[in-house]
């Protein structure tokens, strides 16, 4: 009787299995999470597993079927939208991807009333974007770079728009730099609350440089894909914002807001709108040398038809450390009120938090505080704020949803997910309902990711929307790695650092060490999340040890690390990535003649310049699709970070911080180099001239190019990278195919 | 299907009121600008007034400004004119339009004539 | 208000015909021009919006052009149901103000 368990144990160690390459390319063990597309206080849609789409009351618990999978399926529709009125479904189909947010498809609207397709007046095909009024049943529609409006979808569009143009003019759209690196978004066109005005941004690219590429295809004669593409220190896209009256759009046309004066003084962007009222707007511009933001309060003039941005209500944002803001510049979330406001921003010992700004940035009032940053504002009630931030536990690539009273005085804290599954669950999101009557709690792990409903009011938690049942059974006979997440202590610098241990992790041995990288300004690699994917089949079959780790230029961890690497992109990241790799050697288990390096994009560029860093360290490494010099990439993020490639500016770092500066540095490493030919992104070029200076250097080197293929290496082309990786690592570290 | 039917017209005596009804069916009326053109006998088709969707903003021409209401009951699916001071030369068909965007009248009743003569 | 001048006031023309009539601004109007069609007795019909967009249901032969002051309807083969009145229309700054009218006769 005694033995038994230690019987059952074996025979059950005996059962389990590694995890398989194939296992993360058919994407076995992957996880489902559930984000409730809300329509109310109480109501919210999803679409079952059958493809109906089901409207859910939480109230009386009862949910019916309001589209068919049988309507979706009469017009192949992947995606719908409910208009906010009820009467209509807009059904997409026909879904043709662009860039990383945008794509076009082909709309079909449905009337639920009478049961039928709408008739008449029907939407051109493909259309750049849709989307309803938020009050009603408006359309507002960008087809072929131009916006049109729909009063009801069986209505005849008005065109509101007349100059757009391929490649040359776009409007309600966003150009690729602007998609890429300043929205975040397919769209740039806003209703203001219930629909009275229609905001949108004109981008005139007309004197932009052009990135042109082959496109192979299957014709005799490749095609060539041209993009306006301003890379650092290029002409940029000139932006101008315009509202139109929804109601009467021809009366006075679209009204172009004015651009706050020290803003419009020199090059320019505009980063973000958001509608206060239906009459008062919020517009946030910020200069080309990214470190003075301007959030600008405009309100509608009713005598002369136009919008007035009083200087009174201009509040500037200013780095003297760094850029403004994190990534990007943080938004405001307005109060009830609708002038006074809550933003992330940096406060005096230099990690961001909540303030509340009521009339000048100078006199905002401080919401949080402490050695840890709050991340993310979700919702602003009349009585509650709710936030993110990684406060809890002092860990910070965990996310805990906090909730601040802000009705009563002293505002009083409460962490609403710290402890409701506390192993399982320390990185959360949140999506809530109309007023915060209800909320979903998305925890994205260490444990099995879960997905919950809760009460607004009490924080009880109603019921589990996804628990990944399917996914906790196929893992049971899974022998996963083991994750830690722990911290070094540098020269005043602190590296935190997942390490992702084989399974019978035994500490008396030596084991090959690849460290993944990512290290862009303002990225966080080191967080409490799920996953299964390449490096845990490295740790789990292979026997590796994987390392992250997050160096100075990372997020999350107050100003002094962040802005770090300002002006100098290529040296700390670097830097910090071997300093962590010492240490590691150091705890005696890592087999210092068998470690590598590799990371994609921004992480192609660091293992690259780790890899040549002459240390004698990585004995191989590979770079995927790497950015090899900053002047070959996009110019809203680099210069962000790095200023203008100009003499009296940044020109030498510039020069001194690419991949080709270090072309000798390669002799002594095995590397290999991979790229996607029809990259829109960090383009071909960078690896080109990576394998030029390599070539002219006489040193040799593996490479493999994607034809075809974009930034993300997608399809069948997956497969093949990873395996390619996969045997050139076990060639490395002479593991045994 | 879009339908706007006239009434109230008939024969009035300068100075006197008149009022005109709408009644339209076929679409959600409260959404729309609505509004009155008119045309004298043998002339063409002049503008007389717009309403907003809520009834809230209105519009007039010079001709009639100060003498002629135009209002609506969007639970009644209905647009009124309210005529006073009627002169001579009001005398035209009145029609109800549905003026989409407030820019182009899609949708037009049959008209109802307003004779204004002693 | 602008005012709107249409030419000619009136025309003859065979079925089978290309008809051009013409509509001019005082002020630009942009793209926001409309041409309706009135027969005796009958309301007016929307047949173009926008300038150069059809209404639905109207024959492809009727087409619009133009944009700021100059706009002209185009009816590429006159149809015996054609012979009408014509009216072009603008509305910008919400005072609609009406052409007034060309008719359209058979020879």
């Known amino acids: 009787i005694v033995l038994r368990p230690s019987r059952v144990h074996n025979s059950e160690e005996n059962t389990m299995r590694a995890l398989t390459l194939k296992d993360i390319l058919n994407g076995t063990f992957s996880y489902k999470t559930f984000f409730p597309n809300w329509i109310s206080g109480q109501e919210y849609l999803h679409q079952s597993a059958d493809n109906n789409i089901v409207l859910y009351n939480i109230e009386t618990g009862q949910s019916y079927t309001i589209l068919s999978n049988r309507t979706m399926k009469s017009v192949n529709a992947s995606n719908y939208g409910l208009s906010p009125d009820r009467q209509f479904v807009y059904l997409e189909s026909d879904y043709s991807k662009l860039w990383r947010y945008s794509y076009t498809a082909t709309y079909y609207i449905y009337d639920l009333s009478n049961g039928e397709f709408v008739r008449g007046n029907e939407l051109p095909r493909p259309i750049q974007y849709l989307c309803w009024s938020p009050v009603g049943s408006k359309l507002a529609y960008v087809y072929q770079n131009n916006i049109y409006l729909k009063q009801r979808p069986g209505d005849p569009p008005f065109q509101i728009t007349f100059n757009g143009r391929e490649n040359k003019i776009f409007n309600g759209i966003p150009d690729w730099v602007y998609e890429e690196e300043m929205l975040a978004t397919k769209y740039a066109l806003w209703w203001s609350p219930n629909g009275k005005f229609l905001a949108y941004a004109e981008f005139n690219d007309t004197d932009i440089p052009v990135i042109a590429y082959s496109y192979y295809g299957d014709e005799q004669y490749p095609r060539t894909i041209n993009i306006p593409y301003p890379k650092a220190g290029a002409k940029n896209p000139v932006v101008r914002i315009f509202i139109i009256d929804t109601t009467y759009p021809a009366y006075v046309g679209p009204q172009e807001v004015p651009v706050p004066a020290m803003i419009a003084s020199s090059d320019y962007y505009f980063s973000w709108l958001t509608w206060v009222t239906d009459e008062r707007v919020c517009l946030q511009w910020l200069k080309r040398v990214q470190n003075v933001s301007v959030l600008s309060i405009c309100d509608f003039r009713e005598d002369w038809q136009t919008w007035d941005c009083p200087k009174t209500q201009e509040h500037i944002e200013e780095s003297r450390t760094g850029w403004a803001g994190g990534f990007f510049v943080s938004t405001p979330v307005f109060s009830y009120d609708a002038i006074s406001y809550y933003k992330i921003f940096s406060d005096k010992d230099g990690y961001k938090h909540i303030h509340y700004i009521k009339d000048t940035v100078e006199n905002a009032i401080q919401i949080t505080s402490g050695k840890w940053e709050a991340i993310n504002i979700f919702r602003v009630t009349q009585d509650s704020l709710f936030y993110s931030s990684n406060e809890f536990e002092e860990y910070p690539g965990r996310r805990n949803i906090y909730r601040i009273s802000i009705g009563s005085y002293p505002p009083s804290k409460k962490c609403v997910t710290c402890h409701l599954r506390k192993e399982r669950c320390q990185y959360y999101t949140a999506s809530f309902s109309d007023y915060a009557k209800y909320y979903a709690l998305v925890c994205y792990g260490p444990g099995i990711p879960i997905s919950t409903l809760h009460d607004g009011r009490t924080d009880q938690e109603i019921k589990i929307l996804e628990e990944n049942k399917e996914l906790e059974n196929a893992l049971k006979n899974i022998q996963l790695p083991k994750e830690e997440i722990k911290k070094l202590e540098v020269d005043e610098i602190t590296l935190w650092y997942k390490m992702i241990l084989p399974p019978q992790f035994d500490r008396s041995k030596k084991y090959p060490l690849l460290i993944q990288v990512y290290g862009g300004p303002c990225s966080q690699s080191v967080r409490s999340v799920f996953a299964v994917n390449w490096i845990s089949y490295l740790a789990s079959k292979e026997g590796m040890v994987i390392a992250l780790v997050d160096g100075r230029g990372t997020a999350f961890q107050g100003d002094k690390l962040l802005y770090a690497v300002y002006r100098k992109l290529g040296v700390y990241e670097v830097e910090d990535q071997i300093t962590a790799v010492r240490k590691f050697i150091e705890m005696g288990f890592i087999d210092e003649k068998r470690i590598a390096i590799w990371g994609w994009s921004y992480g192609g560029y660091v293992s690259s310049l780790a890899l040549a860093s002459g240390t004698g360290l990585f004995k191989c490494g590979i770079a995927v699709a790497p950015v090899s010099s900053w002047e070959y990439y996009a110019s809203v993020y680099t210069e962000r970070f790095m200023g203008l490639p100009t003499k009296d500016d940044n020109l030498e770092h510039y020069k001194n911080s690419t991949v080709m500066a270090r072309a000798e540095y390669f002799r002594n490493v095995d590397y290999l180099l991979i790229h996607g030919t029809a990259d829109d992104n960090v383009h071909f070029q960078n690896s080109a001239q990576i394998a030029k200076a390599l070539v002219n250097a006489q040193v040799d080197f593996q490479a493999m190019w994607y034809s075809d293929q974009n930034h993300g290496l997608s399809g069948l082309s997956t497969n093949h990278l990873y395996t390619h990786m996969t045997h050139f690592l076990k060639q490395c570290f002479s593991l045994s195919d | 299907e879009v339908q706007l039917v006239e009434s109230g017209g008939g024969l009035v005596q300068p100075g006197g009121s008149l009022r005109l009804s709408c009644a339209a069916s076929g679409f959600t009326f409260r959404g729309y600008i609505m509004s009155w053109v008119r045309q004298a006998p043998g002339k063409g088709l002049e503008w007389v007034s717009w309403?907003?969707?809520?009834?809230?903003?209105?519009g007039y021409a010079d001709s009639v400004k100060g003498r002629f209401t135009i209002s609506r009951d969007n639970s009644k699916n209905t647009l009124y004119l309210q005529m006073n001071s009627l002169r001579a030369e009001d005398t035209a068909v009145y029609y109800c339009a549905r003026l989409q965007y407030g820019t182009w009248f899609d949708y037009w009743g049959q008209g109802t004539l307003v004779t204004v003569s002693s | 208000d602008i005012q709107m001048t249409q030419s000619p006031s009136s025309l003859s023309a065979s079925v089978g015909d290309r008809v051009t009539i013409t509509c001019r601004a005082s002020q630009s109007i942009s793209s926001y021009l409309n041409w309706y069609q009135q027969k005796p007795g009958k309301a007016p019909k929307l047949l173009i919006y926008?300038?150069?967009s059809l209404q639905s249901g109207v024959p492809s032969r009727f087409s619009g052009s133009g944009s700021g002051t100059d706009f002209t309807l185009t009816i590429s083969s006159l149809q015996p149901e054609d012979f009408a009145t014509y009216y072009c229309?603008?509305?910008?700054?919400?005072?609609?103000?009406f052409g007034q009218g060309t008719k359209v006769e058979i020879k």
């Open positions: 229309q603008q509305a910008t700054l919400l005072l609609p103000t």
């Open positions: 309403i907003s969707p809520e009834g809230s903003r209105t």
């Open positions: 926008a300038a150069s």
